[in-house]
């Protein structure tokens, strides 16, 4: 459900990964889209401190551009998805082990919280740049 | 069609207030910020403030604090900057804008000019 | 508070290349924006995020942005073209928005 608006990025998490001065989509089914978003993300970064140096900065990229979109110039507040090409790169490259590790958590029911997994994007799910090259992010 | 309205001008006197009003139309107006820029005779923009029209949070710039009030009608789409304590050099060209999805400011009113004289 | 220098003035004769810069500590490391206003109208963007430009904006408008300056570069100047520009950027320490001084271009 893509209602919201969109504003600079103002945490701190993202601020060294996002687009110098982006400009973010915040998520109004969270009744303070910037805190929560914010929260998001700071909880799954914890989680990303004991992965390996090859994935953690493709993981900490992919987590910020998920969870605070890039606003797409328009009329209406939408929200730019990643592609799924750079997703999947993170998914199988990048971070192969680890995902397979969150994913084998994920169905034992290991995890405390949903949290992370609002964090984590379906790669599957999203577009790919050669459908359009203007309708999602690349990393 | 984009469109930001602004209200007409106003002469006021030293000390009193003055409010300007800004009708948003062509887009979902509690999707982007606005913002108040002013220009006073033969000087460059400055910086008033901003306000979230979705959550009605603001931010304004120092110099105008405790003078200045920015709020919203969602219900008309329309933003509001309200100025008090007018002094003479108040006297300027309000304009609002608002960046539709850019960080920079892609739509502006027409501009409402005020002049406070006795 | 987070200061945008620019020049006064700058001259060009037609068809040749207008520079106008603005001056920032550390400007490179922010988005820069860059305005157009005429006498008696709105300003109007013609450049944003350092060098992307709006549609319906000319290509002889073009934009850059590193270290302590940045620059709008107007190529192929006309007469129409003759105006007040200024830079802006958005101050994240202070989160407010920034206008530089102001340049006024005029075609010779």
């Known amino acids: 459900d893509n209602k919201g608006y969109c504003a600079q990025y103002r945490g701190e998490v993202c601020n060294a990964v996002l687009a110098k001065d982006a400009l973010v989509f915040l998520n109004t089914s969270y009744a303070d889209p910037e805190e929560a978003q914010e929260l998001l993300v700071h909880t799954a970064w914890n989680e990303l401190k004991v992965v390996s140096p090859v994935c953690r900065p493709a993981a900490e990229a992919l987590l910020c551009n998920h969870i605070f979109q890039e606003c797409s110039p328009g009329v209406v507040p939408t929200p730019i998805p990643i592609c799924r090409e750079y997703c999947l790169a993170v998914k199988e490259l990048f971070c192969a082990k680890e995902w397979l590790v969150m994913e084998e958590k994920t169905h034992r029911g290991l995890y405390r919280s949903e949290m992370h997994l609002l964090s984590v994007p379906e790669c599957s799910k999203l577009p790919s740049m050669h459908w359009d090259p203007t309708a999602c992010a690349r990393l | 069609q984009v469109h930001l309205v602004q209200s007409g001008a106003e002469v006021k006197k030293p000390g009193a207030s003055v409010k300007v009003s800004c009708k948003a139309s062509?887009?979902?107006?509690?999707?982007?910020?606005m913002h108040w820029v002013r220009q006073a005779p033969g000087q460059g923009l400055e910086w008033m403030g901003w306000i979230n029209p979705y959550s009605g949070g603001t931010s304004y710039a120092q110099k105008f604090q405790g003078r200045v009030t920015m709020t919203r009608d969602t219900s008309i789409s329309t933003a509001y900057m309200e100025l008090s304590r007018l002094i003479s050099d108040d006297t300027a060209v309000y304009y609002c804008?608002?960046?539709?999805?850019?960080?920079?400011?892609?739509?502006w009113g027409q501009g409402t000019m005020v002049t406070v004289s006795s | 508070s987070y200061v945008l220098t620019q020049p006064p003035s700058v001259s060009v004769a037609p068809g040749q290349t207008a520079r106008i810069t603005c001056g920032g500590n550390n400007i490179g490391s922010k988005s820069v924006h860059w305005y157009q206003q005429k006498p008696g109208q709105a300003p109007v963007l013609v450049v944003y995020?350092?060098?992307d430009r709006p549609s319906g904006i000319p290509e002889r408008f073009s934009g850059s942005n590193s270290g302590n300056t940045a620059t709008l570069t107007i190529s192929r100047v006309e007469a129409g073209d003759e105006a007040d520009y200024y830079c802006q950027v958005w101050d994240r320490s202070s989160d407010h928005y920034v206008f530089g001084t102001g340049t006024k271009v005029t075609v010779l």
């Open positions: 995020d350092d060098s």
């Open positions: 804008a608002s960046g539709l999805g850019i960080s920079a400011f892609d739509i």
């Open positions: 062509g887009y979902t107006f509690t999707g982007y910020y």
